[in-house]
């Protein structure tokens, strides 16, 4: 009876999410493998988040709006492990917008989700950021490693969206 009611609850939650995400990929997790954590298909998952790589070339603001429509934000990178996971799925000859910007050009960098910007957990390429006119951040492959660079926000780039996993 308990299992039945849990299944019914899950089905109604799935129906609720289906209007936003036609397909979800879920895995069982938790102590008793009773919780399901899901990401929209074909997003990838890492820890408690889902990631989507958009190959559409758009400005930073348009890229953020595009993520927002999908219930996400441009990616906020919190750890080296998270960055290493994300970069496994990136093309080395491309650049991708991050959810990091400095709209006034005052070198006051801010994450789109209001996560505090911690200078100690940043992965700028050597010599970056280097221009107050370049107010948006990308991740790209340079000098044999992935890192961040400041670029013009209006210049179209690919992008990475991130959202919290859906738990049902």
């Amino acid at each position: 009876n308990f299992m039945y009611s849990k299944t019914v609850k899950r089905l109604s939650k799935l129906q609720e999410y289906q209007q936003y995400y036609p397909s979800l990929t879920c895995v069982m997790e938790g102590k008793d493998m009773e919780d399901w954590s899901c990401c929209p298909t074909p997003w990838t998952s890492f820890q408690s988040s889902c990631y989507f790589i958009s190959t559409v070339m758009q400005s930073w603001t348009k890229s953020q709006n595009n993520c927002s429509v999908m219930g996400a934000d441009l990616v906020v990178i919190n750890t080296k492990e998270e960055q290493d996971f994300i970069t496994q799925n990136l093309k080395i000859n491309s650049a991708y917008f991050l959810g990091l910007s400095d709209p006034k050009g005052w070198r006051h960098w801010q994450w789109v989700d209001q996560t505090p910007y911690n200078k100690n957990v940043t992965f700028w390429h050597s010599g970056e950021p280097n221009s107050p006119d370049e107010r948006c951040a990308i991740i790209n492959f340079r000098s044999e490693e992935w890192g961040w660079n400041d670029v013009h926000c209006h210049v179209p780039q690919k992008s990475i969206c991130k959202m919290k996993k859906i738990y049902i």
Epitope: Q58, S59, W60, T61, K104, D133, R135, H154, V155
Partner: antibody
């Protein structure tokens, strides 16, 4: 006082080439992105190309891509537009304009007086 | 590309009266509190001159009878009390993404 002075316009036959120049003074040229904007006779404004302050980024509309090349020489405080394979529809006054960044984008705060390009056989 | 549509094409207003010019973008040119729309004035035989940036910020040296407003896709330039020297063509321009695009212009004349 900020000054932008364009030169190099003239009459050219279809298929011909011209190189426009813009001499900048009164500001630190190397710190600013620059653009060319044109205006066909009796028509509105059409952006033609952009170059970033450090020369790392150039951008063109489809109408001129592959035919026009924007460049700059920061040591000479000069902006250039090399125009090849010119067509009748390229006939216009060409303005050079300075870009000022504002939040996520930019606007044009100073414009030169323009130089006239006429493409006709 | 973002298409900018200005209305009206031309406008005749009596001296001292209010002139209002509208500009509509084919998609939003705002992001949060940033409105990436700008206005220029072009008098006959002269280059364009910046009037308003960021939808509502008056450029230095521009008379305060000029004002701008709007967000998203709809923006307005207002001349509160038209003067003879305001006879010109006015253009809006978006810069939220490349390519930057201009409206077709609105010609303001004295009635």
């Amino acid at each position: 006082e900020v000054q932008l002075v364009e030169s190099g316009g003239g009459l050219v036959k279809p298929g011909g080439s011209l190189r426009l120049s813009c001499a900048a003074s009164g500001f630190t040229f190397s710190s600013y992105g620059m653009s060319w904007v044109r205006q066909a006779p009796g028509k509105g404004l059409e952006w033609v190309s952009t170059i970033s302050s450090g020369d790392s980024y150039t951008y063109y509309p489809d109408s001129v891509k592959g035919r026009f090349t924007i460049s700059r020489d920061n040591a000479k405080n000069s902006l250039y537009l090399q125009m090849n394979s010119l067509r009748a529809e390229d006939t216009a006054v060409y303005y050079c304009a300075r870009q000022i960044y504002y939040d996520y984008a930019y606007y044009f705060d100073f414009w030169g007086q323009g130089t006239t390009v006429t493409v006709s056989s | 590309d973002i298409v900018m549509t200005q209305s009206p094409d031309s406008l005749a207003v009596s001296l001292g009266e209010r002139a209002t010019i509208n500009c509509r973008a084919s998609e939003s040119v705002s992001f949060r509190t940033s409105h990436l729309m700008h206005w220029y004035q072009q008098k006959p035989g002269q280059p364009p001159k910046l009037l308003i940036y960021g939808a509502s910020n008056l450029e230095s040296g521009v008379p305060d009878r000029f004002s701008g407003s709007g967000s998203g896709t709809d923006f307005t330039l207002t001349i509160s009390s038209l003067q003879a020297e305001d006879v010109a063509v006015y253009y809006c321009q978006q810069s939220i993404e490349d390519p930057p695009t201009f409206g077709g212009g609105t010609k303001v004349e004295i009635k």
